[in-house]
Interface confidence: low
Amino acid sequence: EEELQVIQPDKSVLVAAGETATLRCTATSLIPVGPIQWFRGAGPGRELIYNQKEGHFPRVTTVSDLTKRNNMDFSIRIGNITPADAGTYYCVKFRKGSPDDVEFKSGAGTELSVRAKPSAPVVSGPAARATPQHTVSFTCESHGFSPRDITLKWFKNGNELSDFQTNVDPVGESVSYSIHSTAKVVLTREDVHSQVICEVAHVTLQGDPLRGTANLSETIRVPPTLEVTQQPVRAENQVNVTCQVRKFYPQRLQLTWLENGNVSRTETASTVTENKDGTYNWMSWLLVNVSAHRDDVKLTCQVEHDGQPAVSKSHDLKVSAHPKEQGSNTAAENTGSNERNIY
């Protein structure tokens, strides 16, 4: 009679995480008498997966009834597969012995590969805000997927980005993998409503990629533009000067009026108006009593936006002329108007 052979017909089996893996094994003879054991790995370090004779293996069930005398099917099912279950599984026939059974013949092995979905991509931006025209970096991370092949794309408002670097770890064989990508994005003044999207496509996702998003509103700082104008006279000896603070983001803004370098009033932006692009406008006004000044007055609107160094715009108010004559002046006509940083 021909010597018993252990047949493992499947060289490899691919199973999705969470599903059940069927590892097939048949023997060609009932002789010699003895149990079957399943191992993961070969050699002295192999891991016992199932022992027909004894032990408790809650995740393993047999395909056939191994208690039947003429059974030669030793296939097993392993439930709730995880990436950690990946490896080569060997079906091994033992010959009944005393005191211990003796290993008789092993199957050729079945490589179990686990398809595991990537975790939802997590996109994170820079720790500090940046202004338009600056380049900022966004990172995208996704973990726990298998096999290693994966595609990652970056988008800004639906437009695909090309300036990014992606690494998949580990480089060698592993039960599951992680992806890390860093994209560079150039900010524009219109980016308050913009979104950066990281899209991950993997065989386990069946054509429905996972996306992670970051709002550029968390990243961008749009500095304000200032315009100081002199309004028509409200009353005799009184001039109304306004400071238009336009196109800024975020809202956090403090404005200080200076008369000849002395602080006149400080206020915080509250009732702002929002522009279509998500930036804000705000206006502050100062009523100046011209009769209280003997000389020309330099009025400065100084703005501190989002904790940044202050910017300012000045307006020269000539007290020698009659206030009514000055009412028609615009900022453009004020050659003394200037912008500077206050440190």
Partner: antibody
Framework: VQLVESGGGLVQPGGSLRLSCTAS????????MSWVRQAPGEGLEWVSA???????YYTDSVKGRFTISRDNSKNTLYLQMNSLRAEDTAIYYC???????????WGLGTLVTVSS | EIVLTQSPGTLSVSPGERVTLTCRAS??????IAWYQQKPGQAPRLLIY???SRATGIPGRFSGSGSGTEFTLTITSLQSEDFAVYYC??????????FGGGTKVEIK
């Protein structure tokens, strides 16, 4: 990635101490964090861990005495140590735990001395 | 608890030599082993994870291998900066995570 521990010092047996670890350079809330200690002249011993989701894990010798916690808004990991014993004397390292349960970044450590 | 036994405890070698450190686990850990290097007065530094994957920035002279219960860390040509204590750690089981006792690599 940077991890900075603080809060170590000399404490009497039975006393308490709270260690802090401030993290930067990565998205703190997404990662597991851990405390690993090293007694003078000895090897490394894992003490406790907190997963990104907030689940907590302890080695048997500190269960019931130590409490790990985290404040994701402050990027800070804590270890509240009560009923301290002489055998708790060690350098306590804060470490970032990868998704695969090893430690890819470590702080410089803070020394805890339990002595009367 | 998974117990890790490192051998030898101390290894005296000369620069340029090949070094092999062993870490044995008390049960199968599915290749979930990490190796760390620790120099005096410093924190440990990750070298290898998943038994054979090199961590970021680790020179190619460091390599890991093994499966089941026996794992090795090999340094092909020992440099002066490699004299340190090396620890293995299993990252297979959380309850608890365990380290080996360490192997000190010293100058002969």
């Amino acid at each position: 990635v940077q991890l900075v521990e603080s809060g170590g010092g000399l404490v009497q047996p039975g006393g308490s101490l709270r260690l802090s670890c401030t993290a930067s350079g990565f998205t703190f809330r997404n990662y597991g964090m851990s405390w690993v200690r090293q007694a003078p002249g000895e090897g490394l011993e894992w003490v406790s861990a907190s997963s990104g989701s907030g689940s907590t894990y302890y080695t048997d010798s500190v269960k019931g005495r130590f409490t790990i916690s985290r404040d994701n808004s402050k990027n800070t990991l804590y270890l509240q140590m009560n009923s301290l014993r002489a055998e708790d004397t060690a350098i306590y390292y804060c470490a970032k735990v990868t998704w695969n349960n090893f430690f890819d970044y470590w702080g410089l450590g803070t020394l805890v001395t339990v002595s009367s | 608890e998974i117990v890790l036994t490192q051998s030898p405890g101390t290894l005296s070698v000369s620069p340029g030599e090949r070094v092999t450190l062993t870490c044995r686990a008390s049960q199968g850990i599915a290749g979930k082993i990490a190796w760390y290097q620790q120099k005096p007065g410093q924190a440990p530094r990750l070298l290898i994870y998943d038994a054979s994957s090199r961590a970021t920035g680790i020179p190619g002279r460091f390599s890991g291998s093994g499966s089941g219960t026996e794992f090795t860390l090999t340094i092909t040509s020992l440099q002066s900066e490699d004299f340190a204590v090396y620890y293995c750690q299993q990252h297979y089981d959380w309850s608890p995570l365990t380290f080996g006792g360490g192997t000190k690599v010293e100058i002969k």
